[in-house]
Interface confidence: low
């Protein structure tokens, strides 16, 4: 409408007793420059006088009359486009409507702005994303509909009352569109943060508490599991029994299915929280874990390494390489399945024990003819001594020696 003055400013401004209010404002008059400006508090039009009645907070006229409020209220505008105002300090009874009475040479206008002043600092508002999942970075936002150049504030994040280590980014807006202070915190919640309290605390420049907002974190996560085994060290002998129990320490949402895995493969018909293994055999050795699923996904317990112990089985000897040429190197390896691994080996050369040879491997860097023959071994662990296997033959090839003429 070409018959109207054009104003831009926030519709409502918020503050509290003792703070200040900064009112960003622009305008465009219908004609010419501004000649008179009056700031009213709760103005009312008087039909009899054809003028506005109300408390005059600020007055700028040709004759230069200045109300007592003039020190507290400042008009920071100009004669043609800026109508920014500042009230410092602002009081509870400033709440209501502010009326900007503008007069040019031929035109008049009353622009109204709402001012909401509370008795105490009002709380900020924490905004969370609709869903929070463990280990997925989210941005927590704390918004306060307040900012004023004369009254510095800060927003601090707390988790369970302790300042959060992550760096927050604080931004302020003092524009004709919006006035606010905002703090954004990037945060990768862990499952253990579920149910914890996050606080955004409004503080003054000295760090003094003014107000706060709190939220309880709802962190969606896969089931968190604990596996318990009897016996606790998961070391048994063949024929013993083993019991494994799966406990859910946390799940959000609730769990739906349970299963057991051995060496990464699902065990059939094992869908309860207890796994009973009776009269175990050595092939049941392996890594066991339980898996419990919810709508987020499957959770796995730590692995339990079940060791089914048994005495060494009959040994075999592997020779690398036979036949061997004199001066070449040879390695003997004593092979025997056992749990725990053999701690001691006894080596035999042509049926005679090789003194001091107690390791799994015997390495001969330089073979001589006297090394030829049958090599066998016996493996020993804490459960017993294995049997000596058939052994392996080392053939040593060498050139003629001590040639005599007959």
């Amino acid at each position: 409408d070409s018959s109207k003055w054009v104003f831009e400013h926030p519709e409502t401004l918020y503050a509290w007793e003792g703070a200040c209010v900064w009112i960003p404002c622009t305008y465009r008059a219908l004609d010419g420059d501004l000649e008179s400006f009056i700031l009213f508090h709760n103005p009312e039009y008087n039909k009899n006088t054809s003028k506005f009645d109300g408390t005059r907070l600020y007055e700028s006229t040709k004759d230069g009359k200045v109300p007592s409020e003039q020190k507290r209220v400042q008009f920071l505008g100009d004669k043609n486009k800026n109508c920014t105002l500042s009230i410092h300090p602002v009081h509870l009874n400033d709440s209501g409507q502010l009326g900007l009475r503008m007069e040019s040479k031929t035109e008049k206008w009353m622009e109204r702005i709402h001012l909401n002043v509370s008795e105490r600092p009002f709380p900020p508002h924490i905004q969370l994303p609709p869903e929070i999942q463990e280990s997925q970075e989210v941005t927590l936002t704390c918004l306060l509909n307040f900012s004023c150049y004369g009254y510095p504030i800060q927003l601090q994040w707390l988790l369970e009352g302790v300042p959060m280590r992550q760096a927050a980014v604080t931004s302020t807006s003092l524009t004709i569109k919006s006035v606010f202070t905002r703090s954004e915190l990037k945060f990768s919640p862990q499952w253990s943060h579920h149910g914890k309290i996050v606080t955004c605390q409004l503080q003054d420049a000295d760090g003094k508490f003014l107000s706060n907002d709190t939220v309880q974190l709802n962190v969606k996560h896969t089931p968190k599991l604990e596996i318990k085994v009897t016996p606790s060290d998961a070391i048994v002998r063949e024929g013993d029994s083993v019991t494994m129990t799966c406990e859910v320490s946390s799940s959000n949402p609730e769990y739906t299915t349970v299963s057991w895995l051995k060496d990464g493969t699902s065990l059939k018909k094992q869908n309860t929280f207890t796994l009973n293994l009776r009269e175990v055999t050595k092939d049941q050795s392996g890594k066991y874990c339980c898996q419990v699923s919810n709508d987020v996904g499957p959770g796995r317990s730590e692995e339990v390494f079940l060791q089914v112990q048994y005495a060494p089985e009959p040994s075999t000897v592997q020779i690398l390489h036979s036949p061997a040429v004199e001066g070449s190197q040879v390695e003997f390896l004593c092979m025997s399945l056992a749990n725990p691994l053999p701690t001691n080996y006894t080596w035999y050369h042509n049926g005679k024990e090789m003194q001091g040879r107690t390791e799994e491997k015997v390495h001969i860097p330089k073979i001589l003819p006297w090394h030829a023959g049958t090599y066998s071994c016996v493996a020993e662990n804490i459960l017993g001594t294995g049997q000596r296997g058939p052994g392996a033959e080392l053939d040593v090839q060498y050139p003629p020696k001590k040639v005599t003429t007959v």
Partner: nanobody, 122 residues
Framework: QVQLVESGGGLVQAGGSLRLSCAAS????????IGWFRQAPGKEREGVSC????????YYADSVKGRFTISRDNAKNTVYLQMNSLRPEDTAVYHC???????????????WGQGTQVTVSS
């Protein structure tokens, strides 16, 4: 009776050198193995180097190849181990040993000396 007496150990900075000596006596055979093994506290003994008396052929553990050299002086019945570019992980008691065979794990456990301490500081 075979007797082996080691000397030459000591404290040296990383990158430095030492020369160990082993004086052997009482060995009657011409065909035997003599060499060095080492043992660090709490660790398995580890063969370092071995030499056959018959042809002077030498063998080294992978960890010392190119840095250590075994040699002998027949006239003095002495075997030497020249250790260059020493590293902190070379710190151990070094024993001289003699026996019928050279093994990766050392010379065999027939005869060995009291040892000499080598400490390499970083």
């Amino acid at each position: 009776q075979v007797q082996l007496v080691e000397s030459g150990g000591g404290l040296v900075q990383a990158g430095g050198s030492l020369r160990l000596s082993c004086a052997a006596s009482g060995i009657t055979s011409d065909d035997y193995a003599i060499g060095w093994f080492r043992q660090a506290p709490g660790k398995e003994r580890e063969g370092v180097s071995c030499m056959y008396s018959s042809d002077g052929s030498t063998y080294y553990a992978d960890s010392v190849k190119g840095r250590f050299t075994i040699s002998r002086d027949n006239a003095k019945n002495t075997v030497y181990l020249q250790m260059n570019s020493l590293r902190p992980e070379d710190t151990a008691v070094y024993h001289c040993a003699a026996g019928p065979w050279c093994f990766v794990t050392g010379v065999g456990r027939e005869e060995w000396g009291q040892g000499t301490q080598v400490t390499v500081s970083s």
